[in-house]
Interface confidence: low
């Protein structure tokens, strides 16, 4: 009779993570008597996956009933496959021996490859806010995918970005892989509503890429522009001076009025108006009693925006010898000075 052969018909098997892998194995003869064992890997460090004779292997089931006398099918199923299960599996026939069974013949091996989806990409931006015209970096990370081939693209508001660097780790063979990409984005004043998107395409996603997003509203700081103007008189001897704070983001802003360098009032931006581009406008006013001043008054609107150094704009209010003329716009001039 011809000597027993162990046949593993599949050179390779490809399985999705979470699925069940079927590893096929048949023997060509019932003789010699002895159990079958399955191993992952070869040599002294091989890992026992299934032993027909003894042991507990909760993830492994046999395809046919191994207790039947004439059974020659030693195929197994391994449930809930993960990338860590990848490797070459050998079906090995043992001959009954005393005290231990002796390895008789091994199959050629079946390489199990596991496909795993990448995790949802996580996009993170810089720790500190930056102002328009600055270049900021965003990172995108996705993990746990297999095989290694993957494509990553960056977009800003639907427009593809080209200034980025991507690495897939590890470089060599691994059960699963990670991708890390850094993109450089130049901020503009209109970016409060902008989004940066990282898109990852992988064989497991079948044309439906995963996306991670970051809102530039978390990254950008648009500094305000200030304008101080004198309004028509509200009452005799009173001048209304307004400070228009325009196009700022985020909303966190504190304004201080100074009269001749002395703090007159401090307030926090509250009922702001929002512009189409997502920036804010705010206005504060100061009623100045001209009769209380004998000399010209220097009024300063000082704004501290989002914890940044204060910016200010001043207005010189000329105190005339004729109080009744104070109402006219000629009674004051906006020097337009900009102090930091």
């Amino acid at each position: 009779e011809e000597e027993l052969q162990v046949i593993q018909p599949d050179k390779s098997v490809l399985v999705a993570a979470g699925e069940t892998a079927t590893l096929r194995c048949t023997a060509t003869s019932l003789i010699p008597v002895g159990p079958i064992q399955w191993f992952r890997g070869a040599g002294p460090g091989r890992e026992l996956i299934y032993n027909q004779k003894e042991g507990h292997f909760p993830r492994v089931t046999t395809v046919s009933d191994l207790t039947k006398r004439n059974n020659m099918d030693f195929s197994i199923r391994i449930g809930n496959i993960t990338p860590a299960d990848a490797g070459t599996y050998y079906c090995v026939k043992f001959r009954k021996g005393s005290p231990d069974d002796v390895e008789f013949k091994s199959g050629a091996g079946t390489e199990l490859s596991v496909r795993a989806k990448p995790s949802a990409p996580v996009v993170s931006g810089p720790a500190a806010r930056a102002t328009p015209q600055h270049t900021v970096s965003f990172t995108c990370e996705s993990h746990g995918f297999s095989p290694r081939d993957i494509t990553l693209k960056w977009f800003k508001n639907g427009n593809e970005l080209s200034d980025f660097q991507t690495n897939v780790d590890p470089v060599g063979e691994s059960v699963s892989y990670s991708i890390h990409s850094t993109a450089k984005v130049v901020l503009t004043r209109e970016d409060v509503h902008s989004q940066v998107i990282c898109e990852v395409a992988h064989v497991t996603l079948q044309g439906d890429p995963l996306r991670g997003t970051a809102n530039l509203s978390e990254t950008i700081r648009v500094p305000p522009t200030l304008e101080v103007t004198q309004q028509p008189v509200r009452a005799e001897n009173q001048v209304n001076v307004t400070c228009q704070v325009r196009k700022f983001y985020p909303q966190r802003l504190q304004l201080t009025w100074l009269e001749n360098g002395n703090v007159s009032r401090t307030e926090t931006a509250s009922t702001v108006t929002e512009n189409k581009d997502g920036t804010y406008n705010w206005m504060s006013w100061l009623l100045v009693n001209v009769s209380a001043h004998r000399d010209d008054v220097k009024l300063t609107c000082q704004v501290e925006h989002d914890g940044q150094p204060a910016v200010s704009k001043s207005h010189d209010l000329k105190v005339s010898a004729h109080p009744k003329e104070q109402g006219s716009n000629t009674a004051a001039e906006n020097t337009g000075s900009n102090e930091r």
């Epitope: 490809l14 999705a16 494509t151 064989v203 079948q206 044309g207």
Partner: antibody, heavy 123, light 107 residues
Framework: QIQLVQSGSELKKPGASVKVSCRAG????????MNWVRQAPGQGLEWMGF????????TYAQGFKGRFVFSLDTSVSTAYLQIGSLKAEDTAVYYC????????????????WGQGTLVTVSS | DIQMTQSPSSLSASVGDRVTITCRAS??????LAWYQQKPGKAPKSLIY???YRYIGVPSRFSGSGSGTDFTLTISSLQPEDFATYYC?????????FGQGTKLEIK
């Protein structure tokens, strides 16, 4: 070469069910999503939905939820469309069509089509 | 759903003619547009993807153009085997939708 081979024509009575098969050849079924497209007699093409052949997860277009089921048998590289409680208006040619690709972010264009299966529902 | 409108619905032309079929989307689909050719009793054949790219084996006389909402399929010099019905399809948004078709007949 790549081909999608569909099962033959079917004549069914109203209320019956039918299962149309689409066997993938020349590539690995689980690499590309499989779409199903309906064409009623003398009419245009209508997308029914698709099945992610990697996860087995189906997505159905609005008019095809309930009586229509997409499934797979990866061991025989075959995708299936089953229609239950057949009605006369289900009479049509049903096509399977492979999604173009995955690495190129172009997942909704179809590159290969089956030859079509005519399902006739008549009492 | 995104509506795809083709024009004309049918046209007659002669061998050697240059023919243009247009397809309009009810909203922006970027370049996620494909063109298919179908002959009577046959399955559709894929011609163009991403609005402008020909599939391997598709003759160079077929060309696609456009982006956003307006697209065209041009056949530079009609051959006898080109008489068929042509469909556009958007795949920017689910559900995927087709145009109603343009039937190209021999004059």
């Amino acid at each position: 070469q790549i081909q999608l081979v569909q099962s033959g024509s079917e004549l069914k009575k109203p209320g019956a069910s039918v299962k149309v098969s689409c066997r993938a050849g020349g590539y690995t079924l689980t690499d590309y999503a499989m779409n199903w497209v309906r064409q009623a007699p003398g009419q245009g093409l209508e997308w029914m939905g698709f099945i992610n052949t990697y996860t087995g997860e189906p997505t159905y277009a609005q008019g095809f939820k309930g009586r229509f089921v997409f499934s797979l048998d990866t061991s025989v590289s075959t995708a299936y469309l089953q229609i239950g409680s057949l009605k006369a208006e289900d009479t049509a040619v049903y096509y399977c069509a492979r999604t173009r690709g995955y690495y190129d972010f172009d997942g909704g264009a179809f590159d290969y089509w089956g030859q079509g299966t005519l399902v006739t529902v008549s009492s | 759903d995104i509506q795809m409108t083709q024009s004309p619905s049918s046209l007659s032309a002669s061998v050697g003619d240059r023919v243009t079929i247009t397809c309009r989307a009810s909203q922006n689909v970027g370049t996620h547009l494909a063109w298919y050719q179908q002959k009577p009793g046959k399955a559709p054949k894929s011609l163009i993807y991403s609005a402008i790219y020909r599939y391997i084996g598709v003759p160079s006389r077929f060309s696609g153009s456009g982006s956003g909402t307006d697209f065209t399929l041009t056949i530079s010099s009609l051959q006898p085997e080109d008489f068929a019905t042509y469909y556009c399809q958007q795949y920017n948004t689910y559900p995927l939708t087709f145009g109603q078709g343009t039937k190209l007949e021999i004059k």
